[in-house]
Amino acid sequence: IWSAVFLNSLFNQEVQIPLTESYCGPCPKNWICYKNNCYQFFDESKNWYESQASCMSQNASLLKVYSKEDQDLLKLVKSYHWMGLVHIPTNGSWQWEDGSILSPNLLTIIEMQKGDCALYASSFKGYIENCSTPNTYICMQRTV
């Protein structure tokens, strides 16, 4: 059973979220479960390091984008939120908290100003930002 959930503060339009846990989960209480991932959007603004610590304290990590298909609800996310992508100055690459490298063609990331951390925005966009800038953030937990 699927329900059209309109989470006005999070998404630009209706997002299909499964109602029953048999399709997805388990997830922490009040988190969004979608295609075997648990997501939570946190409204308080923190810098990247504080956001990472907050997610870790809940046995989660900052958002990792790995699949446009499995994470299609992210297309519609409103505003800008810290995700778990960071710049590694030693080799110039961008990688996720788990050490994996950013896959090509998953995100269109623009560096409008110098920075080593990245914000997620709608339509699989990313914005590079100074890590010390306060922003809201998305935590994610894999269920499988």
């Epitope: 690459s93 269109t108 990331i109 623009i110 409008m112 100003q113 709608s122 966009k125």
Partner: antibody, heavy 123, light 107 residues
């Protein structure tokens, strides 16, 4: 081959509206950002703003915020720059360009440019 | 916004000579600076990005150096086609900005 082809020169009167275009080809239009730069007669270059054609997310330089509108139609790979009420001071050459991708990240330089559209505003 | 000041305004040199163009930023832009060449009636062309990287197809006689606030574009031996206006541009902070340009003219 990446190409950006701009619409032709325009001569307008003050107060008139105008929309100029920049047709992009030879690459995935929705994987890059496109921008506009102004060059007034005999002067240097000024960033106006940039747009992500995937969802029309737009960023304007403060000097141009509210003065122009940047838009894009991803179905025809075209970016636009428009004015609702032209002034004589809008007389300039306008260039569109594609932002560079370096190590998978879009960075703030134009690697490809349109040929320019000359806009003349005079009564 | 970050102001870029280029010097000199005009550089008069002969073919085969070395050209040294300067760009100074009002605050640090790290290495986030590019150089463009513009010939009369043409769009600019990206020469150097992020201070020292040559863009695709740019001859080796063009080189860039510097970081922080002081940058240099060097043309090791001027060819006839190099006489043009050169602009620097920073992308360290939005709005991105250009310098006012240096004209390299034939002496």
């Amino acid at each position: 081959e990446v190409q950006l082809v701009q619409s032709g020169a325009e001569v307008k009167e003050p107060g008139e509206s105008l929309k100029i275009s920049c047709k992009n080809s030879g690459y995935s239009f929705t994987n890059y950002w496109v921008g506009w730069v102004r060059q007034m007669p005999g002067k240097g270059l000024e960033w106006m703003g940039i747009i992500y054609p995937g969802d029309s997310d737009t960023r304007y330089s403060p000097s141009f915020q509210g003065q122009v509108t940047i838009s894009a139609d991803k179905s025809i790979n075209t970016a636009y720059l428009q004015w609702s009420s032209l002034k004589a001071s809008d007389t300039a050459m306008y260039y569109c360009g594609r932002l560079t991708m370096f190590r998978g990240i879009i960075i703030g330089y134009f690697d490809y440019w349109g040929q320019g559209t000359l806009v003349t505003v005079s009564s | 916004e970050i102001v870029l000041t280029q010097s000199p305004a005009t550089l008069s040199l002969s073919p085969g000579e070395r050209a040294t163009l300067s760009c100074r930023a009002s605050q640090s832009v790290s290495s986030y600076l590019a150089w463009y060449q513009q010939k009369p009636g043409q769009a600019p062309r990206l020469l150097i990005y992020d201070a020292s990287n040559r863009a695709t197809g740019i001859p080796a006689r063009f080189s860039g150096s510097g970081s922080g606030t002081d940058f240099t574009l060097t043309i090791s031996s001027l060819e006839p086609e190099d006489f043009a206006v050169y602009y620097c541009q920073q992308r360290s902070n939005w709005p991105w900005t250009f310098g006012q340009g240096t004209k390299v003219e034939i002496k």
